[in-house]
């Protein structure tokens, strides 16, 4: 039985040209995390972090995605096209797969505040 829950940074905003941390956290389970996949709203892959084999970063993002912190991703040099949904998929043993959602809004405003809070979707 899957007892865990995914906590995410929820709905976040950041300014164009800046950077943002996409972070998910799996809690309430003793399952072993074998891999975390990060995908964008159109289901294209940003990155994979395998527990033993490390990081794979999709070529389109190699210049502006930094692995981490932890199992998260830092997305840099934000553009308006980065606005949208991001999904973290946790592959675990023995539980199976958990999925979390983050919505990122990239703002033109130079005074846009980076607002983030952990929430259970």
């Amino acid at each position: 039985m899957m007892t865990g829950t995914i906590e995410t940074t929820g709905n976040i905003s950041a300014k164009k040209g800046g950077s943002v941390i996409l972070q998910c956290h799996l809690s309430s389970t003793m399952a072993q995390v074998t891999q975390v996949n990060w995908e964008q709203h159109d289901h294209s892959l940003l990155a994979i972090r395998n527990a033993e084999l490390g990081w794979h970063i999709y070529p389109a993002f190699k210049d502006r995605v930094a692995p981490g912190p932890g199992l998260g991703l830092t997305l840099q040099s934000l553009t308006m096209n980065d606005t949208g949904e991001y999904f973290c998929t946790y592959h675990t043993y023995p539980d199976g797969t958990y999925r979390g959602r983050i919505f990122l809004e990239v703002l033109e405003s130079s005074v846009a505040e980076h607002s983030a809070r952990f929430q259970i979707p």
Epitope: N37, S44, L45, I48, L53, H56, P59, A60, P67
Partner: antibody, heavy 119, light 107 residues
Amino acid sequence: QVQLQQPGAELVKPGASVKLSCKASGYTFISYNIYWVKQRPGQGLEWIGGVNPSNGNTNFNENFKSKATLTVDKSSSTAYMQLSSLTSDDSAVYFCTRGNYYGYEFAYWGQGTLVTVSA
Amino acid sequence: DIVMTQSHKFMSTSVGDRVSITCKASQHVSTAVAWYQQKPGQSPKLLIYSPSYRYTGVPDRFTGSGSGTDFTFTISSVQAEDLAVYYCQQHYSTPWTFGGGTKLEIK
């Protein structure tokens, strides 16, 4: 340039073990994973597993977990795969491969070692 | 395990023709797919990855596309030297798996 050097062939008896080598050159050995792929004669490709040379961590295809052991020797920039309790099903070409920069795709391949299991 | 199915084991084509090889994943693999070429007696070579990026030095007649579960590898104008077996491979989740291969034969 990046090179992965493997011995051409190994002849081993059923029940025995064999340790295949893959000597890497032309890049920083600990910066890229080494993967192993099996190809039986006239057949397709099968991923065995991979090793992270910086820390020795391994990830296996479950089908090979009790068959293969993956290790590295950082001092000689060499990856090893030991195959145990060999049977005729293990007769195949074994390739070592290296990933791309921050990529899991197999960008560089050794020439492969043909393992023949025969009494 | 994710099964990668290449529906054609053999494809016959002529020099100058356009040919497409398809690969279907048994479950979602996003864009974590690569294509390899293996000529007789040689090691495989990476041609396309992720799944539309041409690897360094690969001629531009080779292209790839797709996402999710359906992927296509295309040679826009087949050359005699393209005689080979072509494999798709997913690295979305371990164990990473290959398709069974498609052997391209030149008429």
